[in-house]
C-alpha cells in the first residue's frame, strides 16, 4: 500500500502478467466461497440429473437482465452486502381473486396485490431482505406516458413511491421499481394481503388521466387470456435476501483481524 | 500496485507515518494547483484589502452547505469533472416583472422565471456547465406536502422534472433541485425568458390541490415585502462550470502519459 | 475513463483494466456452478506514476495529476472503479439456488 | 466501514482512514486561498493482508476476505472509498472566485 520512492515510475519493472492472473484467479476462488460462506465447494452427490428447472432458469435470467441494466457504480458495500444474496420471486395474487373486484372499473390505475405469507416464506426475517423489486412487463405501446407507483397504505389511502416516464416501445419491456422499504415493512407486520397501484400521473388541470400502459397479466383487455395471466410474466416481486443459515455468521466481530 | 509475495502480510514493516503525511501534503499541493490549472500559486498583488465581499461569502456558504448535505459516495469522475468548477449564482427575474401577471391567481403552483442572458454571462458555452441547481428557501411550515417541479416547455405546456416530499419544519429550509439538463438546453437556445413551475402533486381524484408551501421571495402574501423579495434569499440558480480559459486545456489527449 | 472500451483496445502500459475470463471448470476445477459457465472477471494493473512532486517539477507533473494521482495519494494504486454483480445458479443438496454475488466484475480502473 | 467514526477512535493497524488536517498557510506556505483556512484531507494507510490463498489455508482465510480482499485483487491496496468535495475562495487579480474541488476529503477507506 506504500512503496519506495524509486517505485514511483516503476514502468521499467517487468510485470509477470501470468503470475498476476494466477493470483487473481486464486483470489476469486476464495472470494466466491467466502461470499457464499462455504468452507469448500458443495457436494454434487444429490444433484438431480438433466437440465435446470425452467423456473430456476427464468429467475436466473431475470436477475441477469437486471444486472445488465444496473448502474455499474455500486454503493460502498456494507458488511452484510458483501455476502451472496439468494434470489427468489413471488408472483402477484392471481387476477381471478375477489380482491381485484373493486378495482376493475378504474381507468387511471391498475392494481397488484401480494400475499405477505408468500413473501415471508422466501424471507423469514425483515433484516435478511437486502433488496426487493417490483417487476412488471409492459406490452408494446406507441404512446409516451408519465406513470406513478403507490403502496396500499390503509383502508382507502395510498402512499406515493415513485414515478417513471415511459417512452414508446416496439417490444415488451420489463419495468423495475425498488420497493425494498415497503416489503421490509410488510415483513414487520402480520400476514395478509398488501398491494401496489400503478397509475397515470394526473395533472392539476385534470385533462386525460387514463392509464394508457398495458401490463402483461393485468391489463383489462387481456383478462380472458388465461395463458397470459398464469404465465411467469405477470407482475412479481424479485427478492434478494441473506439466507437464514448464513445470517448467523454475520454477527461475528467486524474488525477482528 | 503489485508487490512481492513476501509483502502479503507486511504488518511487520514499520511505516514512517510522518513521511507518508509529508508525501500526502505535497501531493495535495500539486492536486489543488492541477485542479485549478495553475502552474504556480496566483499572485496576490492586486487583491483588495479588507474582508471578502458579502455576496462572495454567501455563495461560498451556499456551496459549503450543499456539500454537507451531499452523498459522500461520488460517481466515478469523468476527466472534465476532475478540474475545479467556478460557482456562480443567477437570481430569478424580479417578481414585479410583468411576466408573472398571468400566474398570480393559480393556487396549485408558483412560478420562477430566469433570463437566459444572465445565465449565459456566467456560463458562455453549454459544455462548460457541469451542474445547475435550482435553490428555493422554503419558509417554516407545519404541514407535509408532496410537491413537483416542472420546466416551461412551450407556450402553454410544462415538462415534469422531479418531486419531493416536504415534511414540516420549524425553520426556513433550502430546497435544491438538479436542473443541469434544463439549463444546458436553455444555453443551447436563443436568449429569452425561461421558467420553472413548483406545484402541488395533484391526485387523480382531485381533492385538495392547493400548494401549501411558501417560498421566500415568491409566496403571494409576502409580495409587498420588498426587503424579502430583493434579498439574496429569493430563488436562484447555483451554477458550477469550467471557466472558459480553463476549458481550452481539456481537449488535449486524454491518455497522453 | 480507464474502462474496457479504452483499455482493451489499447496497449496502455499504465493503470488500466485488463481482460480476464474465468472458466469455472477449466480455471478453478469447479463443476458445481451450473450457470454461468464462466465470466469476464477482469482486473486492474499498471503503475500510477508521478505520485508526488517538488515545486521544480510542476510544469511537467501538473498535467499528469488527472490520470496518475487524482486523489493526491501519498502512493497511488491501480484499483477497480466500476464493478458489477454476478448471478449464479448452484445446488445445495437437491435444491437449486439462484444467488447474486456483488462487485464481481471489474469494468474500469483508476489510480487512487 | 473503515470510516472516520471507526478509524479515528481505534488503533487499527490494518487499512484505515488516518487523520490529516492541512493548514494552507502553515503546511503549504499559501496565503492565496482566502476560505477555508484549511481542511481535514485525511488519507488511507495500512496493509490489506491475506491477499490470496492456497486450498490448505481456506478455513483461516475465508472469514478475512470481507475486510482484507473483498474485490479478490491479486494484490489489494488501501484506498479511499467515500470522498467529499471542497469549496474554496481565491482571487484572480482583483476578482474573487468561488470554486469547488471534487473528491478532496477522504471519509473512509477500503481494501481494493
Amino acid at each position: 500500500d506504500y512503496k519506495d520512492d524509486d517505485d514511483k515510475l516503476s514502468t521499467s519493472k517487468t510485470i509477470d502478467m501470468e503470475l498476476v492472473k494466477r493470483k487473481r484467479i486464486e483470489a476469486i476462488r476464495g472470494q466466491i466461497l467466502s461470499k457464499l460462506r462455504l468452507a469448500s465447494p458443495p457436494s454434487q452427490g444429490e444433484v438431480p440429473p438433466g437440465p435446470l428447472p425452467e423456473a430456476v432458469l427464468a429467475l436466473y435470467n431475470s436477475t441477469r437482465d437486471r444486472v445488465a441494466g444496473e448502474s455499474a457504480d455500486p454503493e460502498p458495500e456494507p458488511e452484510a452486502d458483501y455476502y451472496a444474496k439468494e434470489v427468489t420471486r413471488v408472483l402477484m395474487v392471481d387476477r381471478n381473486n375477489a380482491i381485484y373486484e373493486k378495482t376493475k372499473d378504474i381507468s387511471h390505475s391498475i392494481y397488484m396485490f401480494f400475499n405477505t405469507s408468500d413473501i415471508r416464506e422466501a424471507v423469514p426475517e425483515p433484516p435478511l431482505l437486502s433488496r426487493a423489486e417490483l417487476r412488471l412487463q409492459r406490452l408494446k405501446s406507441s404512446v409516451e406516458q408519465h406513470v406513478e407507483l403507490y403502496q396500499k397504505y390503509s383502508n382507502n389511502s395510498w402512499r406515493y413511491l415513485g414515478n417513471r416516464l415511459l417512452t414508446p416501445t416496439d417490444t415488451p419491456e420489463w419495468l423495475s421499481f425498488d420497493v425494498t422499504g415497503v416489503v421490509r415493512q410488510w415483513l414487520n407486520q402480520g400476514d395478509g394481503i398488501q398491494g401496489f397501484r400503478f397509475s397515470a400521473h394526473c395533472s392539476c388541470d385534470s385533462k386525460d388521466n387514463k392509464l394508457h400502459v398495458e401490463i402483461n397479466g393485468i391489463s383489462p383487455k387481456r383478462r380472458g387470456d388465461l395463458g397470459t395471466i398464469h404465465d411467469m410474466n405477470r407482475p412479481f416481486l424479485l427478492l434478494m435476501a441473506t439466507p437464514l443459515e448464513r445470517a448467523q455468521h454475520l454477527h461475528s466481530s467486524r474488525h477482528r483481524r | 500496485d503489485y508487490k512481492d509475495d513476501d509483502d502479503k502480510l507486511s504488518t511487520s514493516k514499520t511505516i514512517d507515518m510522518e513521511l507518508v503525511k509529508r508525501k500526502r501534503i505535497e501531493a495535495i499541493r500539486g492536486q489543488i494547483l492541477s485542479k485549478l490549472r495553475l502552474a504556480s500559486p496566483p499572485s496576490q498583488g492586486e487583491v483588495p484589502p479588507g474582508p471578502l465581499p458579502e455576496a462572495v461569502l454567501a455563495l461560498y456558504n451556499s456551496t459549503r452547505d450543499r456539500v454537507a448535505g451531499e452523498s459522500a459516495d461520488p460517481e466515478p469522475e469523468p476527466e472534465a469533472d476532475y478540474y475545479a468548477k467556478e460557482v456562480t449564482r443567477v437570481l430569478m427575474v424580479d417578481r414585479n416583472n410583468a411576466i408573472y401577471e398571468k400566474t398570480k391567481d393559480i393556487s396549485h403552483s408558483i412560478y420562477m422565471f430566469f433570463n437566459t442572458s444572465d445565465i449565459r454571462e456566467a456560463v458562455p458555452e453549454p459544455p462548460l456547465l457541469s451542474r445547475a441547481e435550482l435553490r428555493l428557501q422554503r419558509l417554516k411550515s407545519s404541514v407535509e406536502q408532496h410537491v413537483e417541479l416542472y420546466q416551461k416547455y412551450s407556450n402553454n405546456s410544462w415538462r415534469y422534472l422531479g418531486n419531493r416530499l416536504l415534511t414540516p419544519t420549524d425553520t426556513p429550509e433550502w430546497l435544491s433541485f438538479d436542473v443541469t439538463g434544463v439549463v444546458r438546453q436553455w444555453l443551447n437556445q436563443g436568449d429569452g425568458i425561461q421558467g420553472f413551475r413548483f406545484s402541488a402533486h395533484c391526485s387523480c381524484d382531485s381533492k385538495d390541490n392547493k400548494l401549501h408551501v411558501e417560498i421566500n421571495g415568491i409566496s403571494p402574501k409576502r409580495r409587498g415585502d420588498l426587503g424579502t423579495i430583493h434579498d439574496m434569499n429569493r430563488p436562484f440558480l447555483l451554477l458550477m462550470a469550467t471557466p472558459l480559459e480553463r476549458a481550452q486545456h481539456l481537449h488535449s489527449s486524454r491518455h497522453r502519459r | 475513463a480507464l474502462d474496457t472500451n479504452y483499455c482493451f483496445s489499447s496497449t496502455e502500459k499504465n493503470c488500466c483494466v485488463r481482460q480476464l475470463y474465468i472458466d469455472f471448470r477449466k480455471d478453478l476445477g469447479w463443476k458445481w456452478i451450473h450457470e454461468p459457465k464462466g465470466y469476464h472477471a477482469n482486473f486492474c494493473l499498471g503503475p500510477c506514476p508521478y505520485i508526488w512532486s517538488l515545486d521544480t517539477q510542476y510544469s511537467k507533473v501538473l498535467a499528469l495529476y488527472n490520470q496518475h494521482n487524482p486523489g493526491a495519494s501519498a502512493s497511488p494504486c491501480c484499483v477497480p472503479q466500476a464493478l458489477e454483480p454476478l448471478p449464479i445458479v448452484y445446488y445445495v443438496g437437491r435444491k437449486p439456488k439462484v444467488e447474486q454475488l456483488s462487485n464481481m466484475i471489474v469494468r474500469s480502473c483508476k489510480c487512487s | 466501514a473503515l470510516d472516520t467514526n471507526y478509524c479515528f477512535s481505534s488503533t487499527e493497524k490494518n487499512c484505515c482512514v488516518r487523520q490529516l488536517y492541512i493548514d494552507f498557510r502553515k503546511d503549504l506556505g499559501w496565503k492565496w486561498i482566502h476560505e477555508p483556512k484549511g481542511y481535514h484531507a485525511n488519507f488511507c494507510l495500512g496493509p490489506c493482508p491475506y491477499i490470496w490463498s492456497l486450498d490448505t489455508q481456506y478455513s483461516k482465510v475465508l472469514a478475512l476476505y470481507n475486510q482484507h480482499n473483498p474485490g479478490a485483487s491479486a494484490s489489494p491496496c488501501c484506498v479511499p472509498q467515500a470522498l467529499e468535495p471542497l469549496p474554496i475562495v481565491y482571487y484572480v487579480g482583483r476578482k474573487p472566485k468561488v470554486e469547488q474541488l471534487s473528491n478532496m476529503i477522504v471519509r473512509s477507506c477500503k481494501c481494493s
Epitope: 452484510a80 433484516p127 422499504g181 414487520n188 448467523q248 | - | - | -
Partner: antibody, heavy 117, light 110 residues
Framework: QSLEESGGDLVKPGASLTLTCTAS????????MSWVRQAPGKGLEYIGM??????TYYASWAKGRFTISKTSSTTVTLQVTSLTAADTATYFC?????????????WGPGTLVTVSS | AYDMTQTPASVEVAVGGTVTIKCQAS??????LAWYQQKPGQPPKLLIY???DLASGVPSRFKGSGSGTRYTLTISGVQCDDAATYYC????????????FGGGTEVVVK
C-alpha cells in the same frame, strides 16, 4: 402483558454479568426481543435483538462481548463480558410491537448495572 | 453504517404551540422508522412506526412524516404532558449499525 429485567448489580471492571428479561401474559415464541441500554443522562443505545426463531443481530460495537439468548418461552438473557465503566447504564429489554416487528411496543422498567472498582 | 442524526438536541415550546423534531438517516431507510417518547425514570413508549403510522392509544396531535433519509415528528397543540425526550429509531438495518436510535430531543414545555 409486561416485561421485567433482573440481574443488575454493582460489579468490578473486567467482570461478567447475565441480565434476564421475564415476560408475563405472553410468550416470546411469536415476538422479536431486543436489549437497549441508557447511560445516566444519555440517550438510548441499541445493543442487539433476537428473532422469533432465535437469529441474533447486534450493533457493531456489541459484537463479541454481548450475547443474547432465549432460555425459555418467557425468558431472554443478555450476557456481558469484560465489563468497563463505560457499560454503566440502565439496561432495558423490549418486545416487538406486533408479532414480526423489530420496532418496540412493550418495554420493561429497566435494571441498573454499575461498573466500578 | 446507518447513522441517525436528530435535531435539535433541545427545544422549548409554549403550551398549545407546535414543535417539529427532525431525524436524518445517513442512508435511505425506506420509511422504516419509529418514534418514541421517554419521560425521566420511565422506559420509552412507542408513538409512531413506519414513519407515519400512529401506535395504538397515541393522541392524533402526534404526527410523523418523511421518506428516504429525512423524517419529522410534529407535535401540534402541545400539552404539559408532552414534556419528555423523543427518539427516532431506524429498523431498516439491524447489523450494520452502531446505534439504531437517534441522539434524542428534549422537549421543554413552558
Amino acid at each position: 402483558q409486561s416485561l421485567e429485567e433482573s440481574g443488575g448489580d454493582l460489579v468490578k471492571p473486567g467482570a461478567s454479568l447475565t441480565l434476564t428479561c421475564t415476560a408475563s401474559g405472553f410468550s416470546f415464541s411469536s415476538y422479536w426481543m431486543s436489549w437497549v441500554r441508557q447511560a445516566p443522562g444519555k440517550g438510548l443505545e441499541y445493543i442487539g435483538m433476537i428473532s422469533i426463531i432465535g437469529t441474533t443481530y447486534y450493533a457493531s460495537w456489541a459484537k463479541g462481548r454481548f450475547t443474547i439468548s432465549k432460555t425459555s418461552s418467557t425468558t431472554v438473557t443478555l450476557q456481558v463480558t469484560s465489563l468497563t465503566a463505560a457499560d454503566t447504564a440502565t439496561y432495558f429489554c423490549a418486545r416487538g410491537y406486533v408479532s414480526n416487528s423489530n420496532y418496540w411496543g412493550l418495554w420493561g422498567p429497566g435494571t441498573l448495572v454499575t461498573v466500578s472498582s | 453504517a446507518y447513522d441517525m442524526t436528530q435535531t435539535p438536541a433541545s427545544v422549548e415550546v409554549a403550551v398549545g404551540g407546535t414543535v417539529t423534531i427532525k431525524c436524518q438517516a445517513s442512508q435511505n431507510i425506506g420509511s422504516n422508522l419509529a418514534w418514541y417518547q421517554q419521560k425521566p425514570g420511565q422506559p420509552p413508549k412507542l408513538l409512531i412506526y413506519y414513519a407515519s403510522d400512529l401506535a395504538s392509544g397515541v393522541p392524533s396531535r402526534f404526527k410523523g412524516s418523511g421518506s428516504g433519509t429525512r423524517y419529522t415528528l410534529t407535535i401540534s397543540g402541545v400539552q404539559c404532558d408532552d414534556a419528555a425526550t423523543y427518539y427516532c429509531q431506524q429498523y431498516w438495518s439491524s447489523s450494520n449499525v452502531d446505534n439504531t436510535f437517534g441522539g434524542g430531543t428534549e422537549v421543554v414545555v413552558k
